[in-house]
């Protein structure tokens, strides 16, 4: 071993360096001292450090560590925060477009149903937004409410427009009859299936992104233990006490220290990996009826079809309802009277065709690819931090926590540190409570993501079966579940091109019954020119 270089006889260099950390020189000895009171930088000879300096070094070391950790996660944090915001806004835009498409359909095809229809449509899409953002609403209740509200208006305005005002008290009877007589056929169930599946996946996707932010924020603001502070001080600052200002810590030594300091954080790694892979599975399954963009933008067509279905059955319905609601004042129960089967339109529903440019779908896949480059983020953190702080290359002529060495030996360093600090002990302490909490949250979201990603056994399918979902309605892989038939295919060109349009706000006013509605014109919904041409079956 080379003899240590002679210490600075006056501690001048140490004084000038320390002054940058702590203005004033009262804590720095003018000449080397025995340092018998030191607890971290245990001297092998005279030292230029005092106990107060050591404390300041420890505080600075912990702050340095926190800053290094924050800069290590900055890119990942920005990636998730930015995408969570972009997707939330994009989903809101999809909901607004879907609302405007639906209002436009009513205005063009059923002007007599407005403004009531606008009000009900507005309330329905408000519920959709609330659901996506995490509110505890039952999707079936939402859809039922839409059709419960629409039917009395459809009946009194379209099917039986001659009803006198005094007959409007039959609204309550009509509301009940809507379900009893299945006046919209299986369309409400179809919409329930589509909307519940697509929205549940959308909601969990947003929840997962927001949890990702929470994970990074938690590890970003970890307060490192005093034991870690001592190890960091020994690695970064104890060399100064010997006047070795230009010496860098050995790379191997840095890795050992960082692994000790970050033992708790690294425990997140397993669950973080699973989080990214589960999120990828979820995203891969977000198509057809699991893609809210596809489902919501096609809703206007399915609702249009459902009203056409009512109109086709108008004759039988009017007769049945005439009997059922003749004395609506006395009707205090759900009707047990069921008519013979109504006419059922067997026409196959066609798929809404999408010419993808930069849709939400492609943006989701792009996010996953970027996230996957951070899959080893937590396991790689110790190495990353060492590579972004001053360490000696090739572990030659470097500081091992006690002295300047020609070559770093992990075994020697461990033996030398035995009396000062036990690395193994630090690892055995387990993660901080906040880390344990975030691991629990990751486990929970991973379970949800896995459940949602099972292609045939999604939670929603089971729930729908319990609700009595009929086999003839719409299965997972049936394309016809996407959109209604209308007068042929709905061709949505450049479906959202949403990045370019994110700031483009369609709605003048989100209040129900808004008078400034989108107006389809010349077979195009002109309000949506920035989205490309939306060819709709609305006449």
């Amino acid at each position: 071993q080379p003899p240590p270089p002679p210490p600075d006889a006056t501690c001048h260099q140490v004084r000038s360096f320390f002054q940058r950390l702590q203005p004033g020189l009262k804590w720095v000895p003018e000449t080397p001292v025995p340092g018998s009171d030191l607890q971290v930088c245990l001297p092998k000879g005279p030292t230029c450090c005092s106990r107060k300096m050591e404390e300041k070094y420890q505080l600075t070391a912990r702050l340095n560590m926190e800053q290094l950790l924050q800069s290590a996660s900055m890119e990942l944090k920005f990636l998730i925060i930015q995408n969570a915001a972009v997707f939330q806004e994009a989903f809101e835009i999809v909901v607004r477009h879907a609302k405007n498409y639906t209002n436009a359909m009513f205005k063009n095809n059923y002007p007599s149903l407005t403004p009531q229809a606008f009000e009900f449509v507005g309330e329905f899409f408000t519920d959709v937004s609330l659901y996506i953002l995490g509110s505890d609403i039952n999707v079936d209740d939402m859809v039922n409410e839409l059709f419960d509200s629409l039917f009395p208006v459809i009946y009194t305005q379209l099917m039986n427009p001659g009803l006198p005002d005094s007959a409007l008290d039959i609204n309550e009877c009509l509301r009940g009859a809507r379900r009893d007589l299945k006046v919209f056929g299986n369309f409400p169930k179809l919409i329930m299936t589509q909307v519940s599946k697509s929205l549940q996946v959308t909601r969990i996707f947003l929840q997962a992104l927001n949890l990702g932010i929470e994970v990074i924020n938690t590890t970003d603001h970890l307060k490192f233990s005093k034991d870690c502070g001592r190890m960091l001080t020994r690695m970064w600052y104890c060399s100064y006490c010997q006047g070795l200002m230009m010496v860098k810590p050995c790379g191997g030594y840095c890795n050992v220290v960082m692994q000790g300091c970050m033992a708790g954080v690294v425990e997140i790694d397993k669950y973080w990996r699973e989080y990214i892979l589960s999120l990828e599975e979820l995203v891969n399954g977000m198509y057809r009826i699991y893609d809210m963009e596809n489902v919501l933008l096609g809703l206007f067509s399915t609702i249009h079809d459902s009203i056409q279905y009512v109109q086709k059955n108008a004759g039988k319905l009017t007769t049945t309802i005439g009997k059922l609601c003749a004395h609506s004042q006395q009707r205090q129960y759900r009707s047990a009277y069921y008519p013979e089967d109504l006419f059922i339109d067997k026409k196959v529903l066609k798929v809404a065709h999408v010419e993808h440019e930069e849709t939400l779908s492609s943006r989701r896949r792009e996010l996953i690819q970027k996230l996957k480059s951070f899959i080893s983020f937590y396991s790689a953190l110790p190495g990353y931090i060492c590579s972004h702080s001053p360490v000696a290359e090739n572990d030659t002529l470097c500081w091992n926590g006690q002295e300047l060495v020609e070559r770093y030996s992990q075994k020697a360093a461990r033996n030398g540190m035995k009396n000062q600090f036990n690395l193994h002990e630090l690892k055995m302490k387990g993660p901080e409570p906040v880390v344990s909490q975030i691991i629990d949250k990751l486990k929970h979201i991973n379970q949800l993501l896995r459940t949602m990603s099972m292609p045939k056994g999604r939670v929603l399918d089971k729930n729908l079966d319990e609700e009595g979902f009929e086999s003839g309605d719409c299965g997972d892989d049936e394309d016809e579940c996407i959109g209604g038939s209308g007068d042929g295919m709905i061709k949505v060109k450049n479906q959202l091109r949403f990045l370019a349009e994110l700031a483009y706000d369609l709605d003048v006013d989100d209040a129900p019954g808004n008078s400034q509605q989108a107006t389809p014109k010349d077979n195009e919904i002109s309000t949506f020119h920035n989205l490309g041409n939306v060819h709709s079956p609305l006449k």
Epitope: E119, L133, I137, N138, D510, P512
Partner: antibody, heavy 121, light 110 residues
Framework: QVQLQESGGGLVQPGRSLRLSCAAS????????MAWVRQAPGKGLEWVSE????????YYADSVKGRFTISRDNSKNTLYLQMNSLRAEDTAVYYC??????????????WGQGTLVTVSS | QSALTQPPSASGSPGQSVTISCTGT?????????VSWYQQYPGKAPKLLIY???NRPSGVPDRFSGSKSGTSASLAITGLQAEDGADYYC??????????FGGGTKVTVL
């Protein structure tokens, strides 16, 4: 005509239980969300609980969560509020209210006349 | 959940106008959520005046109008009449779908 009629109120000792009922008539009960709202003497309105039309979702004010349970029987057109571990501060007129919509709380367009619950030893 | 903020009282002479404000937060009034207004006479059940921020149920005079902007809503009563003397409550719901009422405003017709 549309009507809500509460019953079950009265004087009860702290810590005891009470069950309120609300009989609905004149509307299709099973398609609307329903709620309980209370008003302490000389005070403002305080929402207590809400239940969706199907009964699949229930919502509670923090002040009653864990003590009160809302439920409905759509076949009987009846709304219930089971109140356990009653406290003096639960003393109020309890109104049964019909929501305009079925999915969740929005606006209450029909109200009962209220039933007085007094919690006192 | 905390109550929406309303002024405790407001007054006006017959024929004049009165506006009652209702202030909430971004998670109730300021969100997607709608605001409703109720009128209550002493010893009586409340009556719905406005729903969905600005819609009037049938039977409510058009002297009553509602509006919402940001985290605030307001009820305007024009052409004040003696029978408008009552308590008025605003109501909304938060992101957890829990209903929240305002503290109430007593309107006095001078």
């Amino acid at each position: 005509q549309v009507q809500l009629q509460e019953s079950g109120g009265g004087l009860v000792q702290p810590g005891r239980s009470l069950r309120l009922s609300c009989a609905a008539s004149g509307f299709t009960f099973s398609t609307y969300a329903m709620a309980w709202v209370r008003q302490a003497p000389g005070k403002g309105l305080e929402w207590v609980s809400e239940i969706s039309s199907s009964g699949s979702r229930t919502y509670y004010a923090d002040s009653v969560k864990g003590r009160f349970t809302i439920s409905r029987d759509n076949s009987k057109n009846t709304l219930y509020l089971q109140m356990n571990s009653l406290r003096a501060e639960d003393t109020a007129v309890y109104y049964c209210a019909k929501d305009r919509r079925g999915s969740h709380a929005d606006a209450f367009d029909v109200w009962g006349q209220g039933t007085l619950v007094t919690v006192s030893s | 959940q905390s109550a929406l903020t309303q002024p405790p009282s407001a007054s006006g002479s017959p024929g004049q106008s009165v506006t009652i404000s209702c202030t909430g937060t971004s998670s109730d009034v300021g969100g997607y959520n709608y605001v409703s207004w109720y009128q209550q006479y002493p010893g009586k059940a409340p009556k719905l005046l406005i729903y969905g921020n600005s819609n009037r149920p049938s039977g409510v005079p058009d002297r009553f109008s509602g509006s919402k902007s940001g985290t605030s809503a307001s009820l305007a009563i024009t052409g004040l009449q003696a029978e408008d003397g009552a308590d008025y409550y605003c109501q909304s719901y938060d992101s957890s779908l829990r209903v929240v009422f305002g503290g109430g405003t007593k309107v006095t017709v001078l």
